[in-house]
Every structure is written in C-alpha cells, then in structure tokens.
C-alpha cells in the first residue's frame, strides 16, 4: 500500500491522543534505555510503511502484536485516514484470523514495540517531509 495520500495530521492526532498511551502501557515496567533503536524512517509515507509492517508482520520471537490495543487503533487510524487502505488489508486480515494465537508478551515483543515507538516519534517530527 502507498501511504502517500493519507491525512497525516489526522493520523498524528490519533497517535498523540491514544496510540502513544497504549504503547506506553504495553511497555510499562521497561526502561526507555533498555532497547536500541535499529530502524528509523525518512518521511511520513516511509514511517507509516514501516509502522504498518512492524505492527502487523510476525517476526522471530514475537508472533503477533496485531491484537494489542495500540495495533487495533493503528489499523483503525490507517483505515479511516488512508484512502483505500482497508481494501488492501482484507486478505491479510483473513489470513491473520486463521493464525490467531494466545497473546504472550515476550522480551522480543517489548523490543519490537520499542522500535515502533521510535518510528512513531519520527513520524511526528515537525520538520519531517510529507512525501
């Protein structure tokens, strides 16, 4: 999906009002210096591309974050403020339902959410280019 045509300011507002708090809740009890950020993003479409991929792609040691509150709110924000996003996600959602597993917060998931926080912070930088 090409995130170029999203309403970035609306997504930023959704992040600041709720998603950021959910990320903090998920990371509660973890020191902010515990994990090194190894990925970043260039402009706002790039940030959303990486946020979407990191939030919804299973990775080694962290099978799924998709059912977490911050992930569901991220998905909702993208669906509302990125034209055509919902249609591109139908097949992915159906596949995810088949794979659904018990939620387990591993250290790898905490590290992944720490990376997500960094990507969201970068997305919100005032000087970051729209595209």
């Amino acid at each position: 999906y090409d995130f170029t045509n999203c309403d970035f300011e609306k997504i930023k507002a959704a992040y600041l009002s709720t998603i950021s708090k959910d990320l903090i809740t998920y990371m509660s009890g973890t020191k902010s210096t515990e994990f090194n950020n190894t990925v970043s993003c260039s402009n706002r479409p790039h940030c959303l591309t990486e946020i979407q991929s990191l939030t919804f792609n299973p990775t080694a040691g962290c099978a799924s974050l998709a059912k977490e509150m911050f992930a569901m709110k991220t998905k909702a924000a993208l669906a509302i403020w990125c034209p055509g996003y919902s249609e591109t996600q139908i097949n992915a959602t159906q596949a995810m339902k088949k794979r659904r597993k018990r939620k387990v917060t591993t250290n790898k998931c905490l590290e992944q959410v720490s990376q997500l926080q960094g990507l969201w912070r970068r997305f919100n930088r005032p000087l970051l280019k729209q595209q």
Epitope: N36, N37, T38, V39, S42, E50, S53, A60, Q115
Partner: antibody, heavy 117, light 108 residues
Framework: QVQLQESGPGLVKPSETLSLTCTVS?????????WSWIRQPPGKGLEWIGY???????SYNPSLKSRVTISVDTSKNQFSLKLSSVTAADTAVYYC??????????WGQGTLVTVSS | EIVLTQSPATLSLSPGERATLSCRAS??????LAWYQQKPGQAPRLLIY???SRATGIPARFSGSGSGTDFTLTISSLEPEDFAVYYC??????????FGQGTKVEIK
C-alpha cells in the same frame, strides 16, 4: 562486531539475472536493522538499490524496482539480491550493508560484477 | 529526485591542513544527510549522520554542519590516512536515497 561478505558470480551475460548473496556474521539479521544493497560502477559514484528490514518490509530504488528482488534466509543469516535483464550498465562493484533504513553503518568489502557476453 | 552536488571535485592539500568539503542539495533535506569516506579498493565508511553526528569510532577531527540545502564536512587537520574520496548521501526522500558524485582529497 558485525561483518558482511558478498559472494556470487563475477561475470553475467546480458539479459540474464545477476544473483548475489551477503553473509552476515556477528549479528543475527532477524534481530534488528535493515539489510541493503548498494552498487558503484567503475570510477563512478554510489547508487542505493534497496533494503529488506528484519521484520520483512522491503524498499527498492524506483529506477531499479521492476528488475530487483531482495530476499532473506534467516537460517543461514544471509540476504540476497537478484537483478534481472542485466545490461553493460549494470557492471559495478556491488556492496551489501547494514542500515537503519536511512544510512549505512557497516559495509561488505564489495564484489565486482561484470556484464559481458 | 533530490540531486546532491559536491564541490570541489578534487581538493589538493598537505597533511596538517584543514579540509572543507561542500555538499549542496537541489531541495531541502533538513538534517537528513550522511557523509562517507572511501579509500581505493575499499568499501565506504560512515563518518557523519544527521548532518553533524559523528559515527562510532570516528575521530573528532571530522565534523559536519549544515541544514536544508547546504552542508559541509570539515577535517580540521588532515592526517595521511584521510586522503580519500568523500561522499554525501541524503535520506530525506525515501524511496529515492541518493549520493553525491564525490570529492577526492589528494596529497598536494
């Protein structure tokens, strides 16, 4: 300390597919960062080809996108480049590099690929 | 596509002298700029990122400055091992990251 090493054929015929592999040691490619390819034609400047992140997102240089595939084999701690329909203009030293998806902090030593019949 | 123009193409200096290399972007890249050093037959090495932050292990004689469209890499006092080609790279314009054409710093 992370080390990267490119490998693959040094000579490829025009219209064929160039295939290179980068073997990473000292760091698990599924643990973090992005893994990138960059090339440098003889005596010229650098050109970014693309990257694959540790969580699977892929990004390519638009000028090469139609011909490029980057993939990863976590079991071997390797990532690969395929460039199809090559011409003499694809003759270059090809580097693999670790990236934070912005800039490139560790590089392989490079491998020269010549496109010639 | 953002074009990076480096100047001069070649800089002839003696060890101990100060080197000032320029990189100009065709449009603003904020501070999203890196500098690399490349010696003959070797891979590039990251020197500076975010326009002015030194990469790990880079000596303090290397410094970067600038924002927007005009950037400078300064080597305060050239050591023999500093004679090489230097490239700038912008990462403001994903997915079109681009490099400058390079500045060669040679021994006078």
């Amino acid at each position: 300390q992370v080390q990267l090493q490119e490998s693959g054929p040094g000579l490829v015929k025009p219209s064929e597919t160039l295939s290179l592999t980068c073997t990473v040691s000292g760091y698990s490619i599924s643990s973090g960062y992005g893994w990138s390819w960059i090339r440098q034609p003889p005596g010229k400047g650098l050109e970014w080809i693309g990257y694959i992140s540790y969580y699977g997102s892929i990004s390519y240089n638009p000028s090469l996108k139609s011909r490029v595939t980057i993939s990863v084999d976590t079991s071997k701690n390797q990532f690969s480049l395929k460039l199809s329909s090559v011409t003499a203009a694809d003759t270059a030293v090809y580097y693999c590099a670790r990236t934070n998806l912005l800039y490139f902090d560790s590089w392989g030593q490079g491998t020269l690929v010549t496109v010639s019949s | 596509e953002i074009v990076l123009t480096q100047s001069p193409a070649t800089l002839s200096l003696s060890p101990g002298e100060r080197a000032t290399l320029s990189c100009r972007a065709s449009q603003s890249v904020s501070n999203n700029l890196a500098w690399y050093q490349q010696k003959p037959g070797q891979a590039p090495r990251l020197l500076i990122y975010d326009a002015s932050s030194r990469a790990t292990g880079i000596p303090a004689r290397f410094s970067g400055s600038g924002s927007g469209t005009d950037f400078t890499l300064t080597i305060s006092s050239l050591e023999p091992e500093d004679f090489a080609v230097y490239y700038c790279q912008q990462y403001s314009d994903w997915p079109q990251y681009t490099f400058g054409q390079g500045t060669k710093v040679e021994i006078k």
